[in-house]
């Protein structure tokens, strides 16, 4: 049997050591003990007696099925306890009585059906994070379960087999910053929602089939819900159940952010929010995020005209990796307040983008992200976006463009352009002179000779440049990142010719450690202030004698340098 490895600060690692019991020889010097992925099965009352100063105890996936009632009695300093993914079929309040300093408790993934016959947590007055439940057996949430807990930063409940929710069970916790509920069906959703309305600031619903969700008025008085964010992850929705979910929004008037991740919509987007008051109550929602939305019938998808009015005040929309190939012109025109739009990892081509960015589309838009779509012509892209009079920032990275032409048109206010990972080999005057920030990293550039009078930041890492670009091209440059190119040297004159340069990242290049370069680095201790990745990323490539040495440490031979 292997032993623990502990460092000087008392952090002990015993993961995956085939321990069949808590190892002996534990001491008061230990601050953190990780015994995850072992075969411990049993924790006796004296096993942890010596660990009086332990702050972190991690016993994840260690096949524990029995813990003596007083096993943790000496752990008054414990702040973090992870008992997840073990074989504990019942939980005992006596375990937690002594743990008055506990801030984090993870009991998830154990095969209990309830949280025990008595309240587990009345003494845990410092608890901030609690994770409970499991996939198969946890079936009942009762009023006694959370007694004593008044405020939590995070509460995660995995109750995919929930058969009973006792009304008001979650109401006793007065303040929950982030509640994550794993529910397979929507059966108890309304009851739970009523109980958490006045306490939860961020509600996350996971793995829930909402296809049969039906709204009914909640038995609550006028509440001022603090809920700011609502997220659905791995949920299944239909057009009808989406309409029903919208009705919940009348209870959360401060909601500002809605998120859908990995959801499936078994519908056509034929939403019909029946109640006009829903529309006004969406008034504070500013951010809508959709990632990996699966719509089996996405070629029949409606133009969302039924929810146009819901989105008129939204400022930030992300629809990522959801097979979007066209945003209808009329929809774009209704997004009057939209300032930020991210359509990354979709299927947009210029010719259909033209329809989306039609006259009057996205009139307030400042930032547009079209990273990793199917754009092919930089010239066409720029021309199509001329309708966006307020656009200042454009990300068209990770598209594969045809060679850049000599001239292009771009929205006149554009200041930021991301062309990273687009396969470009040459930069031409197609790039607008108005830019303040340009990212051309991860391309095939072997030179950069474009005059950009307003450029403040240039990101050109992972290319093939052999020298730093000429400083006269960028008279007001503040930041240049030119890592992972083929730069062999830089000199006092080169760096000095950038009058305003504050930050240079030039590590991981092929430095030739010549007498000139090494004497310059030795004579200029202030390099560390401008070279943010100095000294570890600056290694000699040649001569062979110095290969792999840091420039800072390399010493030229007296003979070579005084010939």
């Amino acid at each position: 049997q292997e032993s623990l490895s502990c460092d000087a600060s008392g952090v002990c690692d015993g993961r995956s050591r085939s321990f069949t019991s808590i190892p002996s020889g534990l001491t008061a010097a230990m601050k953190s003990l990780d015994l995850s992925f072992n075969k411990i099965t049993y924790i006796g009352h004296g096993d942890l007696r010596a660990c009086a100063n332990l702050q972190v105890l991690i016993l994840k996936s260690s096949r524990i099925n029995t813990i003596e009632g007083d096993a943790f009695y000496s752990l008054g300093s414990l702040e973090h306890l992870d008992l997840s993914d073990n074989h504990l079929s019942s939980l005992s309040s006596s375990w937690f009585g002594p743990l008055s300093s506990l801030k984090y408790l993870n009991l998830m993934g154990n095969p209990y059906q309830t949280l025990g016959v008595t309240s587990l947590f009345p003494n845990l007055t410092n608890l901030q994070t609690l994770r409970i439940g499991n996939v198969e057996t946890f079936s009942e949430i009762r009023r006694i379960d959370f007694a004593g807990l008044t405020s939590l930063n995070e509460l995660e409940i995995k109750a995919l087999s929930l058969r009973n929710y006792q009304s008001q069970s979650l109401k006793s916790i007065r303040d929950i910053h982030h509640l994550t509920l794993h529910l397979s069906e929507s059966a108890f959703l309304l009851e739970i929602f009523a109980d958490i309305l006045s306490s939860v600031r961020y509600l996350e619903l996971r793995d829930t089939n909402l296809a049969r969700f039906q709204f009914s008025p909640l038995p609550v008085d006028e509440v001022s819900s603090p809920m700011k964010k609502l997220a659905f992850r791995g949920s299944v929705l239909t057009d009808e159940s989406f309409n029903e979910l919208l009705k919940l929004l009348r209870y959360i008037l401060e909601l500002s952010e809605v998120e859908f991740d990995d959801c499936t919509l078994n519908g056509l987007g034929d939403f019909n929010p029946s109640e006009s008051d829903v529309v006004s109550e969406l008034g504070k929602v500013e951010t809508v995020t959709i990632r990996r939305l699966h719509i089996p019938q996405f070629y029949l998808f409606y133009d969302l005209s039924t929810v146009y009015s819901l989105l008129e005040k939204v400022k930030r929309i992300t629809v990522e990796n959801s097979k979007v190939f066209l945003v209808p012109c009329s929809f774009s025109q209704h997004l009057k307040s939209l300032e930020f739009l991210d359509l990354s990892e979709n299927l947009m081509v210029e010719e259909y983008l033209k329809n989306s960015a039609c006259k009057g589309a996205w009139p307030s838009l400042q930032t547009l992200v079209l990273s990793q779509n199917h754009l092919r012509s930089m010239q066409k892209t720029g021309e199509i976006l001329l309708t966006l009079k307020n656009l200042t920032s454009l990300d068209i990275s990770r598209n594969t463009f045809h060679p850049m032409p000599d001239s292009c048109q771009w929205p006149e206010k554009m200041r930021f352009l991301n062309l990273s990972s687009t396969g470009i080999r040459v930069v031409k005057t197609c790039i607008p002179q108005t830019l303040e920030v340009l990212d051309v990293s991860n391309n095939n550039l072997d030179s950069f000779s474009l005059f950009l009078p307003r450029l403040q930041e240039l990101y050109i890492s992972r290319n093939k440049l052999k020298t730093l670009p000429d400083a006269s091209l960028f008279p007001v440059l503040l930041v240049m990142k030119i890592r992972e190119n083929a730069v062999s040297t830089f000199s006092k004159d080169q760096l000095g010719s950038f009058p305003k340069l504050e930050t240079l990242e030039a590590g991981d290049n092929h430095f030739v450690c010549s007498c000139e370069l090494l004497s310059f680095t030795m004579e200029t201790p202030a390099l560390a202030q401008i070279l943010v990745d100095w000294p570890d990323s600056y290694l000699c490539d040649s001569p062979p004698r110095l290969h792999g040495h840091r420039l800072q440490d390399a010493r030229p031979s007296v003979l070579e340098c005084h010939q």
């Epitope: 070629y299 990796n321 190939f325 066209l326 990892e345 259909y352 329809n355 199917h374």
Partner: antibody, heavy 118, light 111 residues
């Protein structure tokens, strides 16, 4: 440059299965859908279905739902189509094609001829 | 399924003249202002080659003598002036509704 290289011709017995491959190069494989199209001898084109390598999602022409299975191996940028319970009706040239803009097939493989005969 | 009917099935045309091939869909292929109709050219023993997408957008690298027009249910491919290299098969294809369907093809011949 963009290329889709398909496997060689197949001569198979009735009732057997065959697995055709389509190796992609010159573009980010996971960013595009891969479609499969059938062309019978001297006939028109028939869309079989698509697969999106990024998430493995598929969509089929109902006529091919029980006939074809589509898979991908993203590590080798290769798409596969397996055809089951072959009959003489399945003798055809099968093309893979890259789906761009969600709607059009801008690059095609050279085609694989499948002949079902005993 | 959306049925695409191409006409004529074969078209005899003089080199240097205009050729017009029609494609009629059994229902509209419009998708919010964009017609999801494509045209492909196929030479013997080769795979089809994309000419036009979205009814009228000429694919990069395709000669300017090819153009597409139409909306709703009626579409046409124009070739002007016809060159010898163009005397092959042409197919239309819709991607408005699944399953995607192709027209039966039009064979261009020299008059």
């Amino acid at each position: 440059q963009v290329q889709l290289q398909q496997s060689g011709p197949e001569l198979v017995n009735p009732g057997a299965s065959v697995k055709l491959s389509c190796k992609a190069s010159g573009f980010t494989f996971t960013t595009y859908g891969i479609n499969w199209v059938k062309q019978g001898p001297g006939q028109g084109l028939e869309w079989i279905g698509w697969i999106y390598p990024r998430d493995g999602s598929t969509n089929f022409n109902e006529n091919f739902k029980d006939k074809a299975a589509l898979t991908v191996d993203t590590s080798s940028s290769t798409a596969y189509m397996e055809l089951h319970s072959l009959t003489s009706e399945d003798s055809a040239v099968y093309f893979c094609a890259r789906l761009t803009g969600g709607t059009f097939l801008d690059y095609w493989g050279q085609g694989t001829t499948v002949t079902v005969s005993s | 399924d959306i049925e695409l009917t191409q006409s004529p099935a074969s078209l005899a045309v003089s080199l240097g003249q205009r050729a017009t091939i029609s494609c009629r869909a059994s229902e509209s292929v419009e998708y919010y202002g964009t017609s999801l109709m494509q045209w492909y050219q196929q030479k013997p023993g080769q795979p089809p080659k994309l000419l036009i997408f979205g009814a009228s957008n000429v694919e990069s690298g395709v000669p300017v003598r090819f153009s597409g027009s139409g909306s709703g249910t009626d579409f046409s491919l124009n070739i002007h002036p016809v060159e010898e290299d163009d005397i092959v098969m042409y197919f239309c294809q819709q991607s408005r509704k699944l399953p995607w369907t192709f027209g039966g093809g039009t064979k261009l011949e020299i008059k």
